[in-house]
Interface confidence: low
């Protein structure tokens, strides 16, 4: 609905009368709408609504409001809807950032690895190498490393120590032996909540050149692997967005691991046992899978001398 | 048995407009997205148009864009395509098709895959 | 958009006979490439996705493979039902590009 006048505005726009080429200084029209009809000498200016789709931030002394930014584009997710105070804004949405005008799922730390820094819509999971002490026993983009287990606190022993990617192994000892392996019988004790129900192995993926049976499953969400590791890197001179096909070039031990959650199918990228052979560590050199989803569209800034 | 089956097809002129249903049963249609795909006489395949499991994302192709409007209405199971404006170069079996699986919709990102399930496509032809 | 280009266009071969069809991407698209079959009248038929795995109920003689931009797809051994179009299609961004078609034809 058209306005005469609003109150509480303070700000005013020179305009000049096209009819009489006289300068003349008219009230702004309130944010969310724009000037319909300039201030005469007889008369007020008249403010109209933005019409959908449109908005102004501002006060302002406009004869039509900004258009707002096309839609978010896949698989980027509105932050803010067009209204008529705010453009639209484009988020990338849970699990996923901001990289290179598209949205890339957070990194996927593998077993061994923890979360250091947790991932935003802006930035990257950070992942570290789990310190002494501590292990990672599934790979995730939001789990840290875990304490070993105190054995004993529960007045067990360690039966098998933890490394980096498995928790210690409590056990009893019998009184009569003075083993370190359990005997027949003996109750180990592992700790049962580090098992992540939602991720259960299914089926494996093998890379080419690998033998394997091909999974069936359908599609499944691609994340990457180890693309922002902070601790015990390599210096990364590799490409930043590297295919399926580099992946395999340059970790050749790589498996994915089909895990199923409920409906959802996603691959995790995960380093086998046998990279440790070339020196006790897991090859640390980042990794990104191939950016899916669509650039942001530049969303246009708007300047005008009549507004703000 | 996991079923497509489109209808709605038919001669029309040029300018003119129509709207092809697909119904589906056999899945939980709410669960997927879907696409619109269409194959003109003698020719290939041609990327129509593509609507998430809510329906509240959209996607069009170039030479339809602005003319045609993907929607479903998944408490009837169906997917929808309305063609405004409609040109010779239209003519052409409209196929619906289920995309392999897009559970991950309800994570607020998607990706696509191939299309695992087909209708046997309705003939649309624009003709004076 | 991303142009699908397969070749041969055509192809007559016998049944027993090993197939070769080649998909060429006009920018790379990683791993994301699905092959379809069909056949006159009838609507396509996914036979591989993600370019090398296998859609469930494919016979296991067809197979995939390639990345970045070149992609091929083999049938070994050429049943009398495999005859008919074959579409490679990038699933890598939207609009979703097929390529041209290859026809195997029975020699």
């Known amino acids: 609905q058209p306005e005469q006048k609003a109150s509480n505005l303070i700000g005013t726009y020179r305009h000049v009368d096209r009819a009489t080429g006289q300068v003349l200084t008219c009230d702004k029209c309130p944010a969310g709408t724009y000037v319909s009809e300039h201030c005469t000498n007889t008369s007020l200016r008249v403010c109209s609504s933005c019409p959908v789709g449109t908005f102004t931030r501002h006060e302002n002394g406009i004869e039509k409001c900004h258009d707002c930014s096309q839609p978010c584009p896949w698989p980027m997710i509105e932050k803010l809807p067009c209204a008529a105070l705010t453009d639209r804004e484009c988020t990338c949405p849970p699990g996923m950032f901001q990289s290179n005008a598209t949205c890339a799922p957070h990194t996927v730390c593998p077993v061994g690895w923890g979360v250091r820094k947790k991932g935003t819509e802006t930035e990257d999971v950070r992942c570290k190498q789990c310190a002494r002490g501590t292990f990672s026993d599934v790979p995730s983009s939001v789990m840290k490393c875990k304490a070993y287990t105190d054995c004993l606190s529960q007045n067990l022993v360690v039966i098998k120590p933890g490394t980096k990617e498995t928790d210690n192994v409590c056990g009893t000892l019998p009184s009569f032996s003075s083993s370190t392996s359990p005997s027949p019988g003996t109750a180990i004790f592992p700790r049962p909540e580090h098992m992540e129900t939602h991720e259960v192995p299914s089926s494996t993926y093998v890379p080419k050149g690998m033998n394997s049976t091909e999974s069936n499953s359908s599609a499944s969400v691609r994340p990457k692997v180890l693309s922002s590791i902070q601790e015990g890197t390599v210096p990364d001179n590799t490409s930043s967005a590297r295919g399926k096909e580099d992946v395999n070039k340059t970790l050749p031990n790589l498996q994915v691991v089909n895990h199923q959650q409920g409906p959802h199918h996603r691959h995790i990228l995960k380093l086998l046992p046998s990279m440790e052979a070339t020196g006790g560590e897991k090859s640390s050199t980042p990794i990104k899978g191939p950016k899916r989803g669509h650039p942001r569209q530049n969303l246009h800034k708007h300047f005008d001398i009549n507004e703000h | 048995e996991v079923q497509l089956l489109e209808s709605g097809g038919g001669l029309v002129q040029p300018g003119g407009s129509l709207r092809l249903s697909c119904a589906a049963s056999?899945?939980?249609?709410?669960?997927?997205?879907m696409q619109w795909v269409r194959q003109a006489p003698g020719k290939g395949l041609e990327w129509v148009s593509v609507i998430s499991p809510s329906g509240g994302s959209t996607m069009y192709a170039d030479s339809v864009k602005g003319r045609f409007t993907i929607s479903r209405d998944n408490s009837k199971n169906t997917l929808y395509l309305q063609m405004n404006s409609l040109r010779a170069e239209d003519t052409a079996v409209y196929y619906c098709?289920?995309?392999?699986?897009?559970?991950?919709?309800?994570?607020?990102?998607?990706?696509?895959?191939?299309?695992?399930?087909w209708g046997q496509g309705t003939t649309v032809t624009v003709s004076s | 958009d991303i142009q699908m280009t397969q070749s041969p266009a055509s192809l007559s071969a016998s049944v027993g006979d090993r197939v070769t069809i080649t998909c060429r991407a006009s920018?790379?698209?990683?791993?994301?490439l699905n092959w379809y079959q069909q056949t006159p009248g009838k609507a396509p038929n996914l036979l591989i996705y993600d370019a090398s795995r296998l859609q469930s109920g494919v016979p296991s003689r067809f197979s995939g493979s390639g990345s970045g931009t070149d992609f091929t797809l083999s049938i070994s051994g050429l049943q009398p039902e495999d005859f008919g179009t074959y579409y490679c299609?990038?699933?890598?961004?939207?609009?979703?590009?097929f390529g041209g078609g290859t026809k195997v034809e029975i020699k």
């Open positions: 299609q990038q699933s890598y961004t939207i609009p979703l590009t």
């Open positions: 056999g899945f939980t249609f709410s669960r997927y997205s």
């Open positions: 920018q790379t698209i990683a791993g994301y």
């Open positions: 098709a289920r995309e392999s699986y897009s559970s991950s919709w309800y994570s607020g990102y998607y990706y696509y895959y191939g299309m695992d399930v």
